[in-house]
Interface confidence: low
């Protein structure tokens, strides 16, 4: 009997080049008679071309939707109604081959060929891509707001914003052949709901999506995206109605950058350079392939790759890597964007060197990848520290904080967060080391106090990279480093001459001269601390809501004591830059730190002075009494305080606090308070300083008010951002 074939719709999208026609501006306007007339002719030609091949029996419909340069490029889609079993056989490559074959067969033919009546189609300029009915629907929804732009070499073209009467717009971008397009998106509003999708082809083909961005991203205020070639499409979908365009788009053609390097590393440890995808920090392009060959000077060394917010993971079952594929010594790894630092350590077993390949396996790409490379000693990868196998990083060992996710850096410690005497492995508290009084049996705590020592968890690193044994030597009035760098940048941490916080007391003017009040429209929102002439530090979560993300909203007050009145010592500033820690995660409160750059430098006075910043190795001993200050609520759920409150709190061991908060306390957090509660920070204190007084009389910033369960509740300590855990980022920004 006769069996009906099951027919399915197969959609193709593509472009062809016409050699005997030239592009004109009229063809960018869909309403123009030139566009209508050219479209009719091109549609006819396309249909005749398809039906001239064996695809003709499957032809269903077609449409030429746009034109471009080159001399004239026609962009089209068509649908074939094909038997289901032929679906795989009629791939875009096969369809392209059939059409090219047809074009070539008539190039020198004198016979009349319908599709050659008006157009001389270049067989080499034909491109056919796989599409879907959904793609065509998406394309059609943008045609009421369709913009074609050709951008020449050396040009940067700023694109006209969307038509706000439309719900969707498409920018069809084209550049010179053999170049690649680089699109720059800059969000200009603090909040919006607009969506932009960038494609590696002329229309919105889902399979050729490079990336999509949504809603005035604060994490990425500027996004640069590379296409694999000279054609790109950008689709805008309307969010909330806005009188302002929430973004600026500009595009420029750029040359292909080779991504192949041969390097020989020097005979030294630490970072020796940077490898990155082309045009970093632009998103890498859909057809990126990098090959880096690194030669190591000796088998004593291994190769370390240090990544920022990106890690390498083994991928199961040969699934494609969605965030970049890496092959290192024939091992296949997949990239993964994370909110942590990461290092890949590659043992070297042969002098031939190491080849590292990076490939974008799919059209979907992501932020450019940059990696610092260098050597490490294979026999001692982390001198004085612990190698965390989970993330490849060197972390402090036995300092009372589990820096490694598996906690192995705090296992098998003879002395945890204390000094181990050489003689008998007795443990003594760190402030007793190099204090002039021998506490170990044979005085080993007072040895080597005037000379350089190997760097370790509690040693202080001088500017010349040498280390000193004395803990917390900064700004104590005695130079301990050979280069005197421990006594530099010491104009900080001194209280002014001075005669909310739950369970606190009112502060006097000049008592906490680094205290800042961060306000929006005259309302105190968060605390902060002055750390340099133009920088105030606070908590990142103060800016969590989109409506709080704009620098324009904020005013910073310094020298303030009373919220409802001003006194001559207080000064105010606008904010010129707001930087959240790149690893800040709202849900976990990790890396809860932000820096505000003031619009002009502070003039120091008795009421306005910066607090001292601790070195990464600074040890704030659990049990130490420190102080928190702020205008936060005086009771849980209460209104903010009019007067600046101060309260002393005790630093809590990390493992104890971690237990209370069910292991949600990360190495970037520090706990303070009391088992009985009562004295604590509260709403409105967020971002304010937790400061501890050194023996020198100077105050050092230990933490920032971050989170906690309620305010002053028994058994629940306050959780603070640990400054020593984020100090390298702070220094990198401020200097």
């Amino acid at each position: 009997g006769y069996k009906a074939e099951v027919m399915v719709s197969q959609v193709y999208s593509g472009s062809l080049r016409v050699l005997n026609r030239h592009f004109s501006q009229d063809l960018t306007r869909r309403e123009s008679s030139a566009f209508r007339s050219e479209t009719a002719k091109a549609q006819k030609m396309l249909k005749e071309l398809i039906t001239s091949t064996r695809l003709g029996t499957y032809y269903n419909s077609s449409s030429v939707y746009s034109f471009g340069e080159g001399p004239l490029t026609c962009f089209f889609w068509f649908i074939l109604q094909i038997p289901e079993h032929r679906r795989l056989m009629l791939s875009p490559e096969v369809v392209q081959a059939l059409l090219v074959e047809e074009l070539l067969s008539t190039v020198n033919s004198s016979a009349a060929v319908p599709y050659r009546a008006e157009y001389e189609v270049d067989p080499e300029g034909l491109v056919i891509l796989e599409a879907s009915v959904k793609d065509i629907a998406a394309l059609n929804s943008t045609l009421g707001c369709y913009r074609y732009s050709y951008v020449g070499q050396g040009q940067v073209l700023r694109l006209k914003g969307p038509d706000h009467l439309a719900s969707s717009c498409l920018w069809h971008l084209q550049g010179p052949k053999d170049l690649m397009l680089k699109l720059r998106l800059e969000w200009t509003l603090a909040e919006c709901r607009d969506r932009l999708a960038m494609y590696d082809v002329a229309g919105p083909l889902e399979k050729r999506l490079i990336t999509s961005v949504y809603g005035c991203s604060r994490q990425e205020p500027v996004v640069e995206v590379l296409a694999s070639g000279a054609i790109m499409a950008v689709v805008w979908k309307k969010g909330l109605h806005s009188y302002y365009d929430p973004f600026v788009l500009s595009v420029q053609p750029v040359v292909f950058q080779a991504c192949e390097v041969n390097l020989t590393l020097d005979n030294r440890l630490d970072s020796q350079g940077v490898l990155s995808t082309p045009y970093f920090p632009s998103y890498y392009s859909p057809q990126t392939h990098c090959s880096w060959h690194l030669t190591v000077p000796s088998l004593d060394y291994g190769l370390a790759l240090w990544f920022d917010a990106y890690a390498l993971r083994r991928q199961k079952y040969d699934l494609p890597c969605t965030q970049g594929q890496w092959t290192i010594q024939n091992r296949r790894l997949c990239g993964l964007r994370i909110l942590q630092p990461y290092a890949e350590r590659i043992p070297v077993v042969a002098t031939a060197g190491i080849t590292i390949n990076f490939t974008s396996q799919i059209s979907l790409t992501g932020p450019g990848v940059r990696v610092h490379y260098g050597l490490y000693n294979q026999s001692d990868p982390c001198p004085g520290e612990f190698l965390c196998s989970v993330n490849g990083l060197c972390v402090p060992a036995c300092d009372g904080v589990k820096d490694c996710p598996n906690g192995l850096d705090e296992r098998n410690c003879v002395c945890r967060a204390t000094f181990q005497c050489k003689e008998d492995s007795t443990c003594i508290s760190l402030p007793k080391v190099c204090d002039g009084q021998p506490d170990c049996l044979n005085g080993s705590d007072e040895e080597q106090c005037q000379e350089g020592v190997p760097c370790g968890t509690f040693t202080f690193q001088c500017e010349d990279r040498s280390c000193v044994k004395k803990p917390n030597p900064q700004c104590d009035g005695r130079p301990d480093c050979r280069d005197g760098s421990d006594e530099e940048h010491c104009d900080c941490g001194l209280q002014g001459p001075s005669s909310r916080i739950v369970g606190g007391a009112v502060s006097s003017e000049g008592e906490w001269p680094w205290q800042a009040s961060l306000q929006v429209r005259g309302r105190h929102i968060c605390g902060g601390a002055l750390i340099a002439d133009r920088w105030v530090i606070t908590a990142a979560h103060c800016f969590q809501e989109d409506s709080m993300a704009s620098t324009v909203l904020w005013t910073v007050f310094l020298g303030k004591v009373w919220q409802n009145s001003r006194w001559p010592g207080e000064v105010s500033f606008k904010v010129s830059r707001l930087l959240l820690h790149p690893y800040h995660e709202e849900d976990s409160h990790d890396y809860d730190v932000a820096l505000l750059q003031l619009d002009h430098p502070v003039v120091r006075s008795a009421a306005v002075r910066p607090v001292c910043l601790p070195a990464r190795s600074h040890f704030f001993e659990p049990g130490l009494h420190c102080w928190i200050t702020g205008w936060g609520a005086l009771r849980e759920g209460g209104p903010i305080s009019n007067a600046l409150q101060k309260v002393d709190v005790q630093l809590i061991p990390q493992d104890l606090c971690s237990e209370v908060y069910r292991y949600q306390v990360t190495p970037r957090m520090l706990c303070a308070g009391y088992r009985k509660g009562k004295k604590d920070a509260c709403q409105g204190d967020s971002g304010g300083p937790l400061v501890c007084k050194a023996l020198s009389g100077r105050w050092f910033l230990a933490g920032l008010v971050s989170w906690g369960l309620g305010c002053g509740r028994p058994n629940y300590f306050g959780v603070y951002t640990r400054i020593t855990g984020v100090i390298s980022w702070i220094q990198q920004v401020v200097t």
Epitope: Q25, R147, V156, T188, D245, P246
Partner: antibody, heavy 122, light 108 residues
């Protein structure tokens, strides 16, 4: 009510430097929303944009005048200034300062000073 | 250098409609703006973003955009509308401000 007021000498000798100041009242020049610009109009002719600046000190200039022009800001006085070096008679014009809305795709002047005539003559 | 082209003059009788055009290659990618300038006075913005009217500008002023041309339309022209009209935009990169040469509108 925003007001802009240009001030400076009405007569400048050829080859000297023309200096003008614009005093802004009714809005802070340090507002993050606006740029501030200078435009000139030779007698009987059209408008020509000279350049614009942001309160932070960022500037950009008309390419044809770039080599001779400097725009600077004094946020404490809520003023911005224009200097044009090596003037000739062709620089004789009414000079306007204006608030420049240069936000997103927008790029226009929504408030202007009343203008001041500067004549270049020996 | 990049230029915006305007007709030098347009004449119209009171109550009629006046149309002033401004053309340039970058206008499909950049917005157009219109200013009115009366003798001895500073320019006043009458249309922004091709077709939007600032508050305080009469409804008879409107703007439109088509391809490489923006148009200022004054319907029901009044004697007080006699003035010079300047269009303004930016070059194709969006970097530099450019003014048209101006059009003198005469109300007959």
């Amino acid at each position: 009510q925003l007001q802009l007021q240009e001030s400076g000498p009405g007569l400048v000798k050829p080859s000297e430097t023309l200096s003008l100041t614009c005093t802004v009242s009714g809005d802070s020049i340090s507002s993050h929303t606006y740029w501030w610009g200078w435009i000139r109009q030779p007698p009987g002719k059209g408008l020509e944009w000279i350049g614009s600046m942001f309160y932070s000190g960022s500037t950009y200039y008309n390419p044809s005048l770039k080599s001779r022009v400097v725009i600077s800001v004094d946020t404490s006085r809520n003023q911005f200034s224009l200097k044009v070096r090596s003037v000739t008679a062709a620089d004789t014009a009414v000079f306007y300062c204006a608030r420049h809305n240069n936000w997103g795709m927008e790029n226009y002047f929504d408030d202007w000073g009343q203008g001041t005539l500067v004549t270049v003559s020996s | 250098s990049y230029a915006l082209t305007q007709p030098p003059s347009v004449s119209v009788s009171p109550g009629q409609t006046a149309r002033i055009t401004c053309s340039a290659d970058a206008l499909p990618d950049q917005y157009g703006y219109w200013y009115q300038q009366k003798p001895g006075q500073a320019p006043v913005l009458v249309i922004y973003k091709d077709s939007e009217r600032p508050s305080g500008i009469p409804e008879r002023f409107s703007g439109s955009s088509s391809g490489t041309t923006v148009t200022l339309t004054i319907s029901g022209v009044q004697a007080e509308d006699e003035a010079d009209y300047y269009c303004q935009s930016a070059d194709s990169s969006g970097s530099y401000v450019v003014f048209g040469g101006g059009t003198k509108l005469t109300v007959l």
